[in-house]
Interface confidence: low
């Protein structure tokens, strides 16, 4: 049977097949894919900017940062305000102080410990 390069199309992931000769073809890949048949998802993570222990998760023509709990934002560079998230983080009248990557308690009246409970 006669070989027709683009019938059926060898291009995957939405790539468009173009016949370049009697027995040759090329695939025009959608953004985010590469390879002779668009078989490879381009790794968008090599140039990532995930900070503070964020993990880069490759997507199709994009990436996302999976942030640890105490950080947020596109690149995990924004400090989560634990004092807002945990209104009762400090006991016995202690004052919650937000810090980069965490929080601390300023204790009063002789109380001590991480949460002023001692």
């Amino acid at each position: 049977s006669l070989y027709v390069p683009c019938a059926p199309s060898p291009c995957v992931n939405g790539g468009t097949c173009r016949q370049t000769g009697d027995f040759t073809f090329e695939c025009n890949c959608l953004p985010g894919f590469e390879g002779s048949t668009c078989e490879r998802n381009i790794d968008d993570c090599p140039n990532h900017r995930c900070q503070n222990g964020g993990v880069c998760v490759d997507g199709v023509n994009t990436y996302n940062c999976r942030c640890p709990p105490q950080w947020t934002g596109q690149f995990c560079t924004e400090d989560v305000d634990e004092c807002l998230l945990q209104p009762n983080a400090c006991q016995n009248g202690g004052t919650c102080a937000n810090r980069n990557g965490g929080y601390g308690c300023v204790c009063v009246n002789g109380w001590s410990g991480d949460d002023c409970s001692e």
Epitope: D44, R49, Q51, G53, T62, Q74, T77, G101
Partner: antibody, heavy 117, light 112 residues
């Protein structure tokens, strides 16, 4: 205060090895990518490569691949750029810079490397 | 690699005057995450480059409001509204949307 302090100027002969350093302080060292940027005399800066201190993972500009290595010692919050065999064309100012906001937010003072016979 | 072209190469200015520096990229700098990673730096004589503007128009901490950035896609501009002596030096644009990060060739701002 965030600070990156680099080692002093070096004069070397072609073929010699060299390791220059960049000590970070005033922030959590492991949390931020450290870049190395080359600036040849009278030219603009060129991004060379980076290291992720937390994991030790590196990424290089293809143009510089195989010419130098980047390493880190987390215990002393220091990143390194190292050559095993210097060439005259390695003569340049080398800057380390801390990542942030998708850019280079803080820079070291630079280390001038001169390679001459 | 993305080519970053800055104009002019040299810019003679009067103190108190206004400055406009152009930076063009060989391809769009809009990242698939929606951000545009185009930044501006100043390198004063004998010093390290310092970040002025990140992601087109955001002033870095401590940068005076006489510096402003604008633009989109492939065309970007840095403006200095009232030039002061400490503004003299070489200005560079940098793109970090596409790997590898690439700098423009620089614009030297000097006294007329």
């Amino acid at each position: 205060e965030v600070q990156l302090v680099q080692s002093g100027a070096e004069v070397k002969k072609p073929g010699e090895s060299l390791k220059i350093s960049c000590k970070g302080s005033g922030y959590t060292f492991s949390n931020y990518v450290i870049h190395w940027v080359r600036q040849m005399p009278g030219k603009g800066p060129e991004w060379t490569g980076y290291i992720i201190p937390g994991s030790g993972g590196t990424k290089f500009n293809e143009k510089f691949k195989g010419q130098a290595t980047i390493s880190v010692d987390k215990s002393i919050t220091t990143a390194y750029l190292q050559w095993s065999s210097l060439k005259a064309s390695d003569t340049a100012m080398y800057y380390c810079a801390r990542d942030g906001a998708g850019s280079f937010t803080y820079w070291g003072q630079g280390t001038l490397v001169t390679v001459s016979s | 690699d993305v080519l970053m072209t800055q104009t002019p190469v040299s810019l003679p200015v009067s103190l108190g005057g206004q400055v406009s520096i152009s930076c063009r990229s060989s391809q769009s700098l809009v990242h698939s995450d929606g951000n545009t990673y185009l930044h501006w730096f100043l390198q004063k004589p004998g010093q390290s480059p310092q970040l002025l503007i990140y992601r087109i128009s955001n002033r870095f901490s401590g940068v005076p409001d006489r510096f402003s950035g604008s633009g989109s896609g492939t065309d970007f501009t840095l403006k200095i509204s009232r030039v002061e002596p400490e503004d003299l030096g070489v200005y560079y644009c940098l793109q970090s949307t596409h790997f590898p990060d690439t700098f423009g060739g620089g614009t030297k701002v000097e006294i007329k």
